[in-house]
């Protein structure tokens, strides 16, 4: 006759508050005759969790039909789990006896522990923008998880980062834990469209990690390059001068023209275009009247980008005698 084995396959069962826990128990033999009961804890003070034949256990249901002949599955489900339900659960076989049934064999036990899912990771970037080639720090926080074991990874555009530091608090026993990680990211000029991702993996997430993201567009400032050029062709007695402001981010930009140090108030034509990398180009045209102009006209294009110190480019206007003749010819 085969010796009875009580099989409880899970050593640890993580459950979430409010959910249903399934505790597995199978037997390898139908003998001896007698019931299988579920207890939490051991010794005389152990708590009866389920007795099929008598008592009131409204939160407990059986996984299979215990009344079926030759049933060997005594697994149970406990609904509406609360923190009070944690502990080690044992399925115990009793042999029918008189006056009392006699405990025959116990399963090894399944420890039920509360598993709490981590909150969605929140990623925060630096307070101020930084230019490319510099390093910025991003922090990622997630709270309220249990057990303490957790994995956090950082990615930049899908590439895993290695320069980060992570802390899980508290260090001792607790009902819930928090994680905080700080990653150091070197900014590239093309990072306007880049993202950093903080990925959190935890046993309660069943292989589906949580992610928090931050756009590097919030952290980067790409300063513009300036070029001032004079167009070779003139329109009547006017020469067209162009100021090209290239590859800047963010869009916030103020452009002013000065003629021989005097700020010009008149309207100028301009266009804004966005580059594939997310940076912007700004082109401004300035028409200079060359009739009776001296040769020493200096034009300045000054740009104040994102509240930074102004940068400027100057152009000494080249007006040839030929151009002067043309302009005087054009004057009625």
């Amino acid at each position: 006759e085969e010796e009875l084995q009580m099989i409880q396959p899970e050593k640890l069962l993580l459950v979430t508050v409010g959910k249903t826990a399934t505790l597995h128990c199978t037997v390898t033999s139908l003998l001896p005759v007698g019931p299988v009961l579920w207890f939490r804890g051991v010794g005389p003070g152990r708590e009866l969790i389920y007795n099929q034949k008598e008592g009131h256990f409204p939160r407990v249901t059986t996984v299979s039909d215990l009344t079926k002949r030759n049933n060997m599955d005594f697994s149970i489900r406990i609904s509406s789990i609360t923190p009070a339900d944690v502990g080690t659960y044992y399925c115990v076989k009793f042999r029918k006896g008189s006056p009392e049934n006699v405990e025959f064999k116990s399963g090894p036990g399944t420890e039920m522990a509360l598993g709490a899912k981590p909150s969605a990771p929140v990623v925060l970037g630096p307070a101020a923008r930084t230019t490319p080639e510099h390093t910025v720090s991003f922090t990622c926080e997630s709270h309220g998880f249990s057990p303490r074991d957790i994995t956090l990874k950082w990615f930049k555009n899908g590439n895993e980062l290695s320069d980060f530091q992570t802390n899980v608090d508290p260090t001792g026993q607790s009902v819930a834990y928090s994680i905080r990680s700080t990653a150091r990211v070197v900014l590239d000029p093309w990072d306007v469209r880049s993202q950093v991702i903080c990925e959190v993996a935890h046993v309660t997430l069943q292989g589906d990690p949580l992610r928090g993201t931050a756009n590097l567009s919030e952290a980067i400032r790409v300063p513009p390059t300036l070029e001032v050029t004079q167009q070779p062709m003139r329109v009547g007695n006017q020469v067209n001068v162009t100021c090209q402001v290239r590859k800047f981010y963010p869009q916030s930009l103020q452009l002013t023209w000065s003629e021989n140090g005097n700020v010009c108030q008149r309207e100028t034509a301009s266009t804004l275009t966005e580059n594939k990398d997310g940076t912007y180009n700004w082109t401004s045209w300035f028409l200079v009247n060359i009739s009776d102009q001296r040769d020493d006209v200096v034009l300045t294009c000054q740009v104040k980008h994102d509240g930074q110190l102004a940068v400027s480019k100057r152009l000494a206007l080249e007006v040839t005698v030929h151009q002067k003749d043309q302009s005087s010819d054009a004057t009625p």
């Epitope: 005389p44 009866l48 008592g55």
Partner: antibody
Framework: EVQLVQSGAEVKKPGATVKISCKAS????????MHWVQQAPGKGLEWIGR????????KYAPKFQGRVTITADTSTNTAYMELSSLRSEDTAVYYC??????WGQGTLVTVSS | EIVLTQSPATLSLSPGERATLSCSAS???????LYWYQQKPGQAPKLWIY???NLASGIPARFSGSGSGTDFTLTISSLEPEDFAVYYC?????????FGQGTKLEIK
Amino acid sequence: EVQLVQSGAEVKKPGATVKISCKASGFNIKDYYMHWVQQAPGKGLEWIGRIDPEDAETKYAPKFQGRVTITADTSTNTAYMELSSLRSEDTAVYYCDRGLAYWGQGTLVTVSS
Amino acid sequence: EIVLTQSPATLSLSPGERATLSCSASSSVSSSYLYWYQQKPGQAPKLWIYSTSNLASGIPARFSGSGSGTDFTLTISSLEPEDFAVYYCHQWSSYPYTFGQGTKLEIK
């Protein structure tokens, strides 16, 4: 819905035997212990015994041992309690209950000469 | 056998008052096996509290149960008119199963 319907009131003479039935519906009695409880007029509850209808195993309180027989018929889903050698102090309401949670309405047994 | 002694035998209180009913066992009873029943005249007992402290379905939250070992208590925080009845404690920890003699909760 779980229901336990007991047989009607009985009047018996001392020394006689009474057999009370408890018909169950909404569940199979084979799956539960069926208990019997006595309540004498103006007195408290007293556990008589129980049966496991699955294998007819019984347990009785020492006070009733030898005079009481609890049986069950799983084909009709009915439990029975038979009390013999009746005496006046057996005058009481007898309740059946399923696994200590659901109770029948009670059967009054009057023992009088 | 385990003898359950309930006290007081009768408790006279007014609606709104707090009621404390005690049940003392002659030997230790695991909390899982201590139940309370309510019974009103002419009615069958009703399961009221199971496993020492768990309220049966539909029982108002003003009722609570506590205790361990040999001393158990049923408490009603603020009595309502429908609470006046007889309450029995019951152990099914070992055979023979036993009941306390009951506490009659009556209106003062």
